[in-house]
Amino acid sequence: EVEKTACPSGKKAREIDESLIFYKKWELEACVDAALLATQMDRVNAIPFTYEQLDVLKHKLDELYPQGYPESVIQHLGYLFLKMSPEDIRKWNVTSLETLKALLEVNKGHEMSPQVATLIDRFVKGRGQLDKDTLDTLTAFYPGYLCSLSPEELSSVPPSSIWAVRPQDLDTCDPRQLDVLYPKARLAFQNMNGSEYFVKIQSFLGGAPTEDLKALSQQNVSMDLATFMKLRTDAVLPLTVAEVQKLLGPHVEGLKAEERHRPVRDWILRQRQDDLDTLGLGLQGGIPNGYLVLDLSMQEALS
């Protein structure tokens, strides 16, 4: 906390400019008018104030706006944003995407800080949903942003926003998140033709049900093994050997290398060994010939 001392003669700041970097903290406190600072915030970022000096400037703004800064000030915070606490940010009402971009730019190249997370939360809640422009902006700065949201939060993403999602944005998503995103992607891309559709939907297939995988197997998509390994186990298990062969196309040979890993391992256990043998890959562990397979879940459903 800087002591309240009178401003030395001739040092009263008439504008926010480079000369202020030579002021000690107490001089900034005494000689810079908070209202002047607020109206000339756009200049602060271009002036190389030390972090200690920025603390003083923040203190002045806090005194001027105890209920939270107006957006006209927030948009020009620049490096001063790094001095804000999540508690400060919770007082803000940020509605402009330009303001959001300006503040994310300051934090660029760093991990998502609690301040940034709070800012994004305030912004998205204010908008009511994650629209395409917002999602575009957030994933540009933080590719993992989408996967940091809960399934409940993802449910507010409109299908139209899915067009902004890049494959790398989904790298860290878990199956629960993909379960929410997949139907939205399916809706978003429904008017595309077969091969184009598969290119777009591929990243979301970790949320696809069995019937959609069966449908894809009829379209010569040649799914790669990396995508296949991310499919839901419960969606893969009912697929026949013929369907998996059609789904993977030339990539079917990769099953051998993955036979000990899910979902391939569990799928093998559900197939007849003679069906697996037709692939000529030496996959072992299928149901021996002559055994009868009872689907108990089906039986329970009927009773």
């Epitope: 970097i21 190389p48 104030f49 030390t50 972090y51 200690e52 000096q53 920025l54 490096y79």
Partner: nanobody
Framework: EVQLVESGGGSVQAGETLRLSCTAS????????MGWYRQAPGDECELVST???????NYADSVKGRFTISQDNAKNTVYLQMTSLKPEDTAIYSC?????????WGQGTLVTVYS
């Protein structure tokens, strides 16, 4: 890694002269605005002088006319020529890139002026 090494400090009598040097590595020196900061015992950090990449200079009121900042891009070094030294110039002097926004932090070089 950005490294700045200050040297040239010492103990002198009031009215004498000292020349501080700061040798930089790990960044493009020619493109950087540089500054000399100082911190006296029990006082707060103060910016003494700056030199921008285009060579323009600025000084704190307390040292104007006595201190001169300069740089040698070939040697990646910035200097602070201090004349007519006063006891109140006693401090640890540090050089920084202005973009770092760090101010008085790190080793620095101690200047002691006795009357």
């Amino acid at each position: 890694e950005v490294q700045l090494v200050e040297s040239g400090g010492g103990s002198v009598q009031a009215g004498e002269t000292l020349r501080l040097s700061c040798t930089a590595s790990g960044f493009t020196f020619d493109d950087s605005d540089m500054g000399w900061y100082r911190q006296a015992p029990g006082d707060e950090c103060e910016l003494v002088s700056t030199i921008s990449s285009d060579g323009s200079t600025n000084y704190a009121d307390s040292v104007k006319g006595r201190f001169t900042i300069s740089q040698d891009n070939a040697k990646n070094t910035v200097y602070l020529q201090m004349t007519s030294l006063k006891p109140e110039d006693t401090a640890i002097y540090s050089c920084r890139t202005m973009a770092s926004r760090i101010g008085c932090w790190g080793q620095g070089t101690l200047v002691t002026v006795y009357s």
